[in-house]
């Protein structure tokens, strides 16, 4: 069920994912100057139960010059720091992802990681984008794409997400001159907040074992 | 019941630091852009820094660049805004503010781009 693709390139756009579903898997890659600890992990995978999804295998770097007497230090998988047992959705919230069985948080960054992360994503993934610096949305809402089996085959959704770029006169996108407004909350900004379904998580399953390599660098 | 409450605040002598904190509770946090705006005495709220859902930008105000960063927690629904280098220009009133749309597909510098605001920080720099 590994998607067969990359998700779409959108121009000026970069995207992420704010969970992983279960099968996931994130190549352990080491910064230049440091390799894998022999029979270190090649990768990490989401995995999970009906109540619990953390990342299997532990990603541990050493350098290349020494031979195997670097001491490792392995963070704690974020699930056990940020997992909540309960979280409150407030109703206008769209569901956070990593809050659901099945999925998995970003990992905890490994001691001399690569700066540039390779995942393997699996169908029914999404992915989130966002225009970058200097570039404007022209409708701000969500703009996701989801891994889909279609007739045996996979593929990304397009997002549905234009960038447009600024005059050089503005800061960044959308800026303006703020109205004074005598308190902290300005009052045309009571009760603005954008709601849509194509926040449901994506529950399609899919049988096929081909690879996706996904690059994105890790910050 | 969306909340972000503002602490860090106080008086620093010019060239000093501050570093301020905002927790936020009853939104999904992870998913919003988060910005810092100021309001000086008898001046207009003014943009300070903001940095995104997916913690890949940050931007600041031409003021404050160099001087500022931003940062957030997603685990514990924290965003910071560590202040140095201060000049008694700094001197205001510093709000926290989370983005209107959850997982927005931009950044915005203005205001009205930001729905949920908390009650703000008194920072008084002198020189």
């Known amino acids: 069920e590994l998607c067969d693709d990359d998700p779409p390139e959108i121009p000026h756009a970069t995207f992420k994912a704010m969970a992983y579903k279960e099968g996931t898997m994130l190549n352990c890659e080491c910064k230049r100057g440091f390799r894998r600890i022999k029979s270190g992990s090649l990768y990490m995978l989401c995995t999970g139960n009906s109540s619990h999804s953390s990342w299997d295998n532990q990603c541990q770097c050493t350098s290349s010059a020494t031979r195997n007497t670097t001491k490792q230090v392995t963070p704690q998988p974020e699930e056990q720091k940020e997992r909540k047992t309960t979280e409150m959705q407030s109703p206008m919230q769209p569901v956070d992802q990593a809050s659901l069985p099945g999925h998995c948080r970003e990992p905890p960054p490994w001691e001399n990681e690569a700066t540039e992360r390779i995942y393997h994503f699996v169908v029914g993934q999404m992915v989130y984008y966002q225009c970058v610096q200097g570039y404007r949305a022209l409708h701000r809402g969500p703009a996701e794409s989801v891994c889909k089996m279609t007739h045996g085959k996979t593929r990304w959704t397009q997002p549905q997400l234009i960038c447009t770029g600024e005059m050089e006169t503005s800061q960044f996108p959308g800026e303006e001159k703020p109205q004074a407004s005598p308190e902290g909350r300005p009052e045309s900004e009571t009760s603005c907040l954008v709601t849509t379904t194509d926040f449901q998580i994506q529950t399609e399953m899919a049988a096929t074992m081909e690879t996706s390599i996904f690059t994105t660098e890790y910050q | 019941q969306v909340q972000l409450v503002e602490s860090g605040g106080g008086l620093v002598q010019a060239g000093g630091s501050l570093r301020l904190s905002c927790a936020a509770t009853?939104?999904?946090?992870?998913?919003?852009?988060m910005g810092w705006f100021r309001r000086a005495p008898g001046k207009e709220r003014e943009f300070v820094a903001a940095?995104?859902?997916?913690?890949?930008?940050?931007y600041f105000a031409d003021s404050v660049k160099g001087r500022f960063t931003i940062s957030r927690d997603n685990g514990k629904n924290m965003v910071y805004l560590q202040m140095n280098s201060l000049k008694p220009e700094d001197t205001a009133v510093y709000y926290c503010?989370?983005?209107?749309?959850?997982?927005?597909?931009?950044?915005?510098?203005?205001?009205?781009?930001?729905?949920?605001w908390g009650q703000g920080t008194q920072v008084t720099v002198s020189s």
């Open positions: 009853g939104l999904t946090f992870r998913q919003h852009n």
């Open positions: 503010a989370a983005d209107n749309i959850p997982l927005a597909s931009d950044m915005r510098a203005t205001a009205t781009a930001y729905g949920y």
């Open positions: 940095i995104s859902w997916n913690v890949g930008s940050t």
